[in-house]
């Protein structure tokens, strides 16, 4: 004998307490295969999740994640903080560093740049929003003759790119 | 059509713990199935269930703390992945009965399992 | 996560009595009407009264009434016997993958 459940289309449900009829799926709740007695419960994209696909009687909701997070796992199980090198997450998102500091990293947030002069050095390469300043030795260390007691020479500022 | 659970023992904190639920007259692919805990002296806890095909929903608070599986057609299981003191409780598995036809878990809880006893104890 | 406030306990009336359980849900329950009531007595598993709100659960007598909509829900014991000291739960379903049903805290019921 055939099962009278076979025969109930995904959408639906075979119901146990009805004499086995076939009765569409409630709101927010799904079957994607034929013949099944139960329907599932529609995933729901809440807090950094978005909602990529809309649950419909057949088919799950499919989720990915806000900006400044990135999809893990089978079928975005998870999200993860992911910015771009030279952002910061904020909570509206992924933001570019501010002048003045930087991240090389895609994940964390924005750190100053060093500032060579506390070091008593120059700065040899300038920052950037992605990567430091590169800090080189002083003036002075770079004069012919120049010994250890030699007075540090007024370092500049820190430079900068355009952002 | 009966319910009953078993596997619940003493148990160190952090050591996993699986507790088995056994159907009898019924089959798990035809019902969803929850299961509940009662800590002493506290009330009911809802901690999650499974659907007909298998799809697993946990409370907010027992997800990642727990996993429902369905090994066979009659028989499913609810793992405690690090218990602490505060798992300490009864667990009690129960079908749903979905008297009312919605065709997905409704809180019709009928029949439930005796429970079993989980002591969590250093 | 919706939360479900029941009568304090415990609630006390003599046998023959009548006594009444409410259950107050902060959000509406799926459909208006998706919420059950349960038995629990000490060293036994609970019990199904009433599911959908009014439906009396098979084997259940009919002293026990379930009624309500949406948020607010009541369980009605009338002709009180003794075998009815227990604590009764009302449970919430709502449209949500995660905190799918919500548990209310309990309300203890002491026949004199």
């Known amino acids: 004998l055939q099962d009278p459940c076979s025969n109930c289309p995904a959408g639906t449900f075979c119901d146990n307490n009805r004499n086995q009829i076939c009765s569409p799926c409630p709101p927010n709740s799904f079957s994607s295969a034929g013949g099944q007695r139960t329907c599932d419960i529609c995933r729901q994209c809440k807090g950094v999740f978005r909602t990529r696909k809309e649950c419909s009687s057949t088919s799950n909701a499919e989720c990915d994640c806000v900006p400044g997070f990135r999809c893990l796992g089978a079928g975005c199980a998870m999200c993860e903080e992911y910015c771009q090198q030279g952002q910061e997450l904020t909570q509206k998102g992924c933001k570019d560093c501010c002048f003045g500091t930087f991240n090389d990293q895609k994940r964390g947030i924005c750190r100053p740049w060093t500032n060579c002069s506390l070091d008593g050095k120059s700065v040899l390469v300038n920052g950037t929003k992605e990567r430091d300043v590169v800090c080189g030795p002083s003036p002075a260390d770079l004069s012919p003759g120049a010994s250890s007691v030699t007075p540090p020479a007024p370092a500049r500022e820190p430079g900068h790119s355009p952002q | 059509q009966s319910v009953e659970e078993s596997g619940g023992r003493l148990v160190t904190p952090g050591t996993p713990l699986t507790l088995t639920c056994t159907v009898s007259?019924?089959?798990?692919?035809?019902?969803?199935m929850t299961w509940v805990r009662q800590a002493p002296g506290k009330g009911l806890e809802y901690i999650g269930i499974?659907?007909?095909?298998?799809?697993t929903y946990y409370a907010s608070w027992a997800k990642g703390r727990f996993t429902i599986s369905k090994t066979s057609s009659t028989t499913l299981e609810l793992k405690i992945t690090s218990p602490t003191t505060e798992d300490t409780a009864i667990y009690f598995c129960?079908?749903?009965?979905?008297?009312?036809?919605?065709?997905?878990?409704?809180?019709?809880?009928?029949?439930w399992g005796p429970g079993t006893l989980v002591t969590v104890s250093s | 996560a919706a939360v479900l406030t029941q009568t304090p306990s415990p609630v006390s009336a003599a046998v023959g009595g009548t006594v009444t359980i409410s259950c107050q849900a902060s959000?509406?329950?799926?459909?208006?009407?998706?919420l059950s009531w349960f038995q629990k007595k000490p060293g036994q598993p609970p019990k199904l009264l009433i599911y959908s709100a009014s439906s009396l659960a098979s084997g259940v007598p009919s002293r026990f009434k379930g009624s309500g909509s949406g948020t607010q829900f009541t369980l009605t014991i009338s002709d009180l016997e003794s075998d009815d000291a227990a604590t009764y739960y009302c449970?919430?379903?709502?449209?949500?993958?995660?905190?799918?049903?919500?548990f209310g805290g309990g309300t203890e019921v002491v026949v004199k």
């Open positions: 499974m659907s007909g095909s298998g799809s």
């Open positions: 449970t919430g379903r709502y449209n949500s993958d995660t905190d799918t049903f919500v």
């Open positions: 959000q509406s329950v799926v459909g208006n009407s998706l």
């Open positions: 129960a079908r749903d009965g979905d008297y009312a036809g919605w065709g997905y878990a409704t809180g019709a809880f009928d029949p």
């Open positions: 007259g019924f089959s798990l692919s035809d019902y969803y």
